[in-house]
């Protein structure tokens, strides 16, 4: 803003070039091809103006009563095209007795501060100073539309000019454009388009896949009801006014479809009875995934070929398949669904569970005391383990010694070729409780039922063995 600081008003000639005709206070550059703006005055020339005046309350001794202060009439309405330049002014004659004056520009009730092109010029004479405040806008935009006024503060009074209405006309401007949508096949939907001038009216044509939908334009705003689509389409709208036409962005209307199958399924971890998988979802078919299905088939000529189905949420894209058999081969596929339906199953991938622990305990466990050697003999039969338990690597023997006030558990490991073991007597006059479990790479199986034997004090002999019966012999 180039407004001068408040000037002391001093006498001097008023330049002859200053004209009082209110229309001449509007200045517009005449460039090549330039159309002069239209101008309307809110009041007729010469008509007395009584609004927004300041009446001086104080007069110096012997002086005449000063006339009311008011801004001169100027152009009231300027219509011009976007990107043109415009300059408009307000003027006022102020008696020289007023030492400090400032003029400010306001638009739509807010003061225009900062880097606006406002210039105030002073033309002093003997008794009054003519002040012309001009405001210029280069390359006007729609945002420059509005009501502009000048304000002058003088002796704590505020003088306000008539408003100058700036109307920037241009191509239609969209306030609402159609939005991309994902719709169900053959289902009706609406698209909305709204554009404004000035100039008004703004008329709307709808375009589908480069062809106009409506032969007759509709006044903005316009709602297009599409009865339904069977395939993807691109819609846009054309907004027309006297200045020309603006085309909205083209929006794609997608038809919801079943998703594509996942594009990657990975095995992350396998245990004896579970497999952790992840997948990368395929294209969602323009409809969010709802859930996924993990399908599992056992790859075994002897299996009945049935498929286990595990339903899970669509996210995270990971699932731990449980309740599987140990040391088994599985074929795994993943399918996901959206509101339309299920995707095809991904290509089947292969995965194997690891060895499991044995599911049965050793059989016919017998325990007897060999007093001469001061040890306990333990014998058993190899359990009938399933193939899934994997290869037997040995046995774990638990023996617990209990006597008055003490209890002590010891564990022994023996190799898979053994079916007997000897353990040293730990405590006399005590009960020894023996249990045996089979061991594979998959882990330790269940322990056999406990077999108890009493270890007497030294010198007392009983060779009678203790045993667990074999299954079916009880």
């Amino acid at each position: 803003r180039e407004e001068a600081k408040p000037y002391p008003l001093f006498p001097g000639p008023l330049p002859g070039s200053l004209q009082t005709d209110h229309t001449s206070l509007l200045s517009l550059p005449h460039t090549s091809g330039y159309q002069p703006a239209l101008m309307f005055s809110p009041t007729q020339p010469g008509r007395p103006y009584t609004g927004n005046v300041a009446i001086p309350r104080v007069t110096s001794a012997g002086s005449k009563l000063l006339p009311p202060l008011a801004f001169k009439h100027t152009v009231g309405h300027i219509i011009l095209s976007e990107h043109k330049d415009v300059k408009f002014n307000c003027s006022i004659s102020v008696p020289n007795i007023y030492q400090d004056t400032t003029i400010s520009w306001w638009k739509d009730g807010k003061e225009l501060l900062g880097a606006h092109h406002a210039i105030t010029q002073f033309y002093p004479d003997d008794e009054v100073t003519a002040i012309i405040a001009s405001f210029s806008i280069t390359s006007v935009q729609r945002s420059d539309n509005g009501s502009y006024i000048c304000k002058m503060k003088i002796n704590n009074e505020e003088i306000v000019s008539d408003p100058i209405y700036i109307e920037v006309q241009g191509l239609p401007h969209f306030t609402k454009q159609p939005e991309s949508m994902n719709v169900t096949r053959n289902t009706a939907f609406n698209l909305t388009c709204q554009a404004v001038g000035p100039p008004e009216p703004v008329n709307i044509f709808w375009v589908q896949n480069s062809s106009r939908v409506n032969e007759q334009p509709e006044k903005s705003p316009s709602v297009l009801t599409v009865p339904g689509l069977t395939e993807m389409a691109v819609f846009s709208c054309e907004a027309h006014n006297d200045k020309g036409l603006t085309v909205s962005k083209g929006v794609q209307i997608n038809i919801k479809a079943i998703p594509s199958p996942p594009t990657e399924v990975s095995i992350h971890n396998s245990t004896a009875h579970s497999i952790l998988i992840s997948w990368v979802p395929g294209f969602d078919g323009y409809s969010p995934f709802r859930n996924c299905s993990v399908q599992v088939k056992e790859v075994d000529p002897l299996s009945n070929g049935s498929v286990m189905i595990f339903n899970t949420s669509a996210s995270p894209h990971m699932y731990q398949i449980k309740q599987l058999q140990a040391l088994a081969n599985y074929s795994i596929g993943v399918s996901c669904m959206n509101e339309i339906g299920w995707s095809a199953v991904s290509p089947w991938i292969l995965a194997s569970t690891t060895e499991g622990a044995p599911s049965v305990a050793p059989l016919n466990v017998t325990v007897f005391l060999n007093e001469s050697r001061d040890n306990v003999d333990i014998r058993w039969m190899k359990p009938l383990t399933k193939r899934q338990a994997g290869e037997l690597v040995g046995y774990r023997i638990s023996h617990v010694w209990q006597s008055a006030g003490i209890s002590k558990e010891l564990l022994e490991e023996v190799g898979q070729n053994n079916s007997r073991a000897q353990i040293s007597v730990q405590v006399h006059n005590a009960t020894c409780t023996v249990r045996i479990a089979a061991v594979t790479k998959g882990g330790v199986g269940p322990f056999s039922d406990p077999v108890k034997i009493f270890i007497p004090a030294h010198g007392w002999v009983d060779h009678a063995p203790s045993s667990t019966p074999a299954p079916g012999n009880a």
Partner: antibody, heavy 119, light 112 residues
Framework: QSVEESGGRLVTPGTPLTLTCTVS????????MSWVRQAPGKGLEWLGI?????DPVYATWARGRFTISRTSTTVNLKITSPTTEDTATYFC????????????????WGQGTLVTVSS | AQVLTQTASSVSAAVGGTVTISCQSS????????LSWYQQKPGQPPKLLIY???KLASGVPSRFSGSGSGTQFTLTISDVQCDEAATYYC????????????FGGGTEVVVT
């Protein structure tokens, strides 16, 4: 949907070269990608795969000679120390489905970019 | 190492005739069926024809068919057309840690 390779040019032996693959119409966050090459007048050779969920997997002969990497928008193939035997057209290819680095099928091929290694 | 062998490097066929191309895998391909076939014309990239041994890729004429499982696979083109003169490659996925994919050496089809 399309795949496009770039970066192929004449290089001298031993000068590292990086080829870039850009895609459109689909997302690299969804698909594994492979590189395949073809020497003039010869057959197709698979170099490796960069998956979404696991580390890159290379053909045995290609390990150490090539590095495959990916960003959110590109897949890159670095020829670490080219020899004259690496003169070929290099194709970037979308993998329709994969598991643990095993491609199921290669369904979308780029036009290829020619690399010439000569002193 | 994974090897796919296409025994015939070139085969001829008359227009309207039938062509059979074989592909042998060692070892067996992943899941017994992860084998695909590709067509390559001079100056062009390969194009997917068949996957999972027998499934037709999108947009491929039904005159192309595939069969086989495990280690032996066949591509058949019936009612051969002139523009199907090309080199055909088999390719397979394998379950080892590396070399998880390999191409056969290719078979050129000459249409007379």
């Amino acid at each position: 949907q399309s795949v496009e390779e770039s970066g192929g040019r004449l290089v001298t032996p031993g000068t590292p070269l990086t080829l870039t693959c850009t895609v459109s119409g689909f997302s690299l966050s969804t698909y594994s990608m492979s590189w395949v090459r073809q020497a003039p007048g010869k057959g197709l050779e698979w170099l490796g795969i960069v998956s979404v969920a696991i580390d890159p997997v290379y053909a045995t002969w290609a390990r150490g000679r090539f590095t495959i990497s990916r960003t959110s928008t590109t897949v890159n193939l670095k020829i670490t120390s080219p020899t004259t035997e690496d003169t070929a057209t290099y194709f970037c290819v979308r993998v329709a489905f994969s598991t643990n680095g095993i491609p199921h099928r290669l369904d979308l091929w780029g036009q290829g970019t020619l690399v010439t290694v000569s002193s | 190492a994974q090897v796919l062998t296409q025994t015939a490097s070139s085969v001829s066929a008359a227009v309207g005739g039938t062509v059979t191309i074989s592909c042998q895998s060692s070892p067996s391909v992943y899941n017994h069926n992860w084998l695909s076939w590709y067509q390559q014309k001079p100056g062009q990239p390969p194009k997917l024809l068949i996957y999972e041994a027998s499934k037709l890729a999108s947009g491929v004429p039904s005159r192309f068919s595939g069969s086989g499982s495990g280690t032996q696979f066949t591509l058949t083109i019936s009612d051969v057309q002139c523009d199907e003169a090309a080199t055909y490659y088999c390719a397979g996925g394998f379950s080892s840690g590396s070399d998880s994919f390999a191409f056969g050496g290719g078979t050129e089809v000459v249409v007379t």
